[in-house]
């Protein structure tokens, strides 16, 4: 019998290499059975995950999964870092794996490096 626990399917060790000034959508894949849980995003600050308040979020329904989306409009250098989504389910908090945004500022680069190159060249990134 399939579990009806809420699952947040952010991939282990996932990251996104993005450019400051661009729009970006960070997606939290959510699997649930009957009632869609309340989902929130937070940003890691050391060992603490600080809840993101007042941000543009939305839901997207696909065939087998729903996605809780955090919108960056646009991406700022300060958005660099690691994020988690979490869900309230049956009075419990379910947390996702963290996913990392690597942000580079195109103004500081003569041309846009490749996304994979950005992730492997930390001196291009904002801390």
């Amino acid at each position: 019998k399939e579990s009806c626990d809420v699952q947040l399917y952010i991939k282990r060790q996932s990251y996104h290499s993005i450019f400051a000034g661009d729009p970006f959508k960070l997606e939290c894949p959510v699997k649930y059975c009957a009632h869609r849980p309340q989902v929130t995003w937070c940003k890691l600050n050391g060992t603490t995950c600080v809840k993101l308040e007042g941000r543009h979020t939305s839901w997207k329904q696909e065939k087998n999964l729903s996605f809780f989306i955090l919108h960056f409009e646009p991406v700022l250098p300060s958005d660099n870092g690691s994020y988690r989504c979490s869900a309230n389910f049956l009075s419990a908090i379910i947390e996702s794996h963290s996913t990392t945004l690597y942000v580079t500022d195109v103004k500081s680069a003569s041309e846009r490096p490749s996304k994979d190159e950005m992730a492997s060249r930390p001196w291009l990134l904002y801390s």
């Epitope: 699952q7 282990r12 696909e62 087998n64 999964l65 992730a119």
Partner: antibody, heavy 120, light 108 residues
Framework: QVQLQESGPGLVKPSETLSLTCTVS????????WSWIRQPPGTGLEWIGY???????KYNPSLKRRVTISVDTSKNQFSLKLSSVTAADTAVYYC??????????????WGQGTLVTVSS | EIVMTQSPATLSLSPGERATLSCRAS???????LFWYQQKPGQAPRLLIY???TRATGIPARFSGSGSGTDFTLTISSLQPEDFAVYYC?????????FGGGTKVEIK
């Protein structure tokens, strides 16, 4: 039912660039990670790299200097380019989808594979 | 990178027999990071087992996975004619993703 189909030249000359495209049908390329895997004749499987539909990539370090994976969501396709090929790059190349309802990096749908031979 | 070693390279058995395939990782990995695939000649691999022991959709109950740490096992309780194939393990504990060299299960 999701289906993947590889296409591209079956013969590439040494030092040239191998180019393959994977067309996804029966489902959207969006919200998934997509991968290339190869299998030299008579041997095991080697992961080449992945791309997310938004464009983020990760490559096998052993091939990283030569590999580019790109995505075209409007065509429901993603592509592989492998530069400076040698005979050692002769293999069956598979495209595959990374399972969505998972925290991990395993492959639930595969193309049928296309044999690419590197020879002059 | 994590090296996955499979043994034996070839397993010769008769239909109805039990097959036990081994996969060993070069470093300890959690159960959640181990997968098994089946590949028949001229076909792409097919996901059998994820999380070391959970059968993928549509996989018969005669296939089971077990193990932890560095040692994992795929067991086919009673070989059917369609089970004769090559089996691969894969890890995703660390990148790059790596596969074992495969075990060929052939008809004796």
């Amino acid at each position: 039912q999701v289906q993947l189909q590889e296409s591209g030249p079956g013969l590439v000359k040494p030092s040239e660039t191998l180019s393959l495209t994977c067309t996804v049908s029966g489902g959207s390329i969006s919200y998934y990670y997509w991968s290339w895997i190869r299998q030299p004749p008579g041997t095991g499987l080697e992961w080449i790299g992945y791309i997310y539909y938004s464009g983020s990539t990760k490559y096998n370090p052993s091939l990283k200097r030569r590999v580019t994976i790109s995505v075209d969501t409007s065509k429901n396709q993603f592509s592989l380019k492998l530069s400076s090929v040698t005979a050692a790059d002769t293999a069956v190349y598979y495209c595959a989808r990374i399972r969505g309802d998972s925290y991990g990096w395993d492959f639930d749908y595969w193309g049928q594979g296309t044999l690419v031979t590197v020879s002059s | 990178e994590i090296v996955m070693t499979q043994s034996p390279a070839t397993l010769s058995l008769s239909p109805g027999e039990r097959a036990t395939l081994s996969c060993r990782a070069s470093q300890s990995i959690s159960n959640n990071y181990l997968f098994w695939y089946q590949q028949k000649p001229g076909q792409a691999p097919r996901l059998l087992i994820y999380g070391a022991s959970t059968r993928a959709t549509g996989i018969p109950a005669r296939f089971s996975g077990s193990g932890s740490g560095t040692d994992f096992t795929l067991t086919i309780s009673s070989l059917q004619p369609e089970d004769f194939a090559v089996y691969y393990c894969q890890q995703d504990y660390n990148f790059p993703l790596t596969f074992g060299g495969g075990t060929k299960v052939e008809i004796k």
